[in-house]
């Protein structure tokens, strides 16, 4: 059977959800007036960069859009971006596409996503509404790096 990405709804402990604004991902408080994105997640087949202690290597995309999460250095700082790319195009590549890869690790009932390109940098939401989803190496009070994933049909 051909592999297919799994679909998840994502929120943090403060009920901030991910919303597409143009070609950017922002965090906004859950409400009836916003439409959260559904995350596509698929495991990478190439094991070159694998590290079981850090979690499973996955590609992350936005369901219904040819957009995938991608890490790049901008002005010397690891930055999270969306790139026009079909998640299945990444999956079928024999060689791991490192900038698009994240370690997906479970911490209790939550999920954590760490950049493979930039170890120690995690996908995060700010405590402030309307801010972009970003990468941080400071896990804690001001940045939320733990997310609840709910499987979506």
């Amino acid at each position: 059977r051909e592999a297919a990405p799994k679909s998840y709804a994502i929120r943090d402990s403060r009920q901030m959800v991910w919303v597409l604004s143009g070609n950017s991902l922002i965090a906004a408080p859950l409400s009836r007036s916003i439409k959260p994105v559904t995350l596509h997640l698929i495991a990478c087949r190439d094991t070159e960069f694998s590290d079981k202690e850090k979690g499973n290597m996955v590609y992350l995309g936005i369901k219904g859009k040819d957009l995938c999460l991608f890490c790049a250095e901008i002005q010397g700082k690891p930055t999270l971006q969306l790139k026009e790319k079909n998640i299945m195009d990444l999956y079928v590549e024999k060689k791991a596409q490192k900038p698009f890869l994240f370690f997906h690790n479970k911490e209790g009932s939550t999920s954590v996503f760490q950049s493979v390109s930039y170890p120690g940098w995690f996908i995060a939401t700010s405590t402030t509404s309307g801010q972009p989803i970003f990468l941080t190496k400071e896990r804690g009070i001001t940045n939320n790096t733990n997310f609840y994933l709910d499987s979506v049909e």
Epitope: A9, P29, L30, S31, S33, T38, D150, V152
Partner: antibody, heavy 120, light 107 residues
Framework: QVQLVQSGAEVKKPGSSVKVSCKAS????????ISWVRQAPGQGLEWMGG????????DYAQKFQGRVTITADESTSTAYMELSSLRSEDTAVYYC?????????????WGQGTLVTVSS | DIQMTQSPSSLSASVGDRVTITCRAS??????LNWYQQKPGKAPKLLIY???SLQSGVPSRFSGSGSGTDFTLTISSLQPEDFATYYC?????????FGQGTKVEIK
Amino acid sequence: QVQLVQSGAEVKKPGSSVKVSCKASGGTFSNYAISWVRQAPGQGLEWMGGILPILGTVDYAQKFQGRVTITADESTSTAYMELSSLRSEDTAVYYCAREPWYRLGAFDVWGQGTLVTVSS
Amino acid sequence: DIQMTQSPSSLSASVGDRVTITCRASQTIYKYLNWYQQKPGKAPKLLIYAASSLQSGVPSRFSGSGSGTDFTLTISSLQPEDFATYYCQQYSSIPYTFGQGTKVEIK
């Protein structure tokens, strides 16, 4: 199996209030919103409002604003809809319906309905 | 409020027929449209969400299509248990609004 069980039929006088309950079982209450939808005899469906128990936020249709109050008790996984200043046009079957938090407005599980009759 | 208009309001069909019901929104609702089936004395049942996604447990003879303002529910081969009233509903913005319903009757 997720179920929404509503309270029984009510007969009310014009000007009075009615409170209908909706008890959820078989799912995580906080992962869902609950909306209330009514249907007058032989008529279509009308959304009244809904609550997100996890946040305690409530939205109402303008038509019912000030006359309807929707609440939820997470400890008992029960939602409530109170409609005041009842008139004969409020005679209808009142349904509660569940919505996943990530797809608000898509009612995937419904209660059995509660008939409210307003008559003098 | 967004107005939802269904057509036809009723139709007669036979078992095995292909049935199409349309729904038009008064303004764009993207793909934020659901379809429900309701039988007399029963609560509505979600068939299709997000215009074209089949709800779990719903037979594959039901399908939905469309985006923007024009939407279609298709029953590829009508079965005896499909005789009911069908409603479209938008969830693009509140208040959520329903179409007036389409009653599918036995010819």
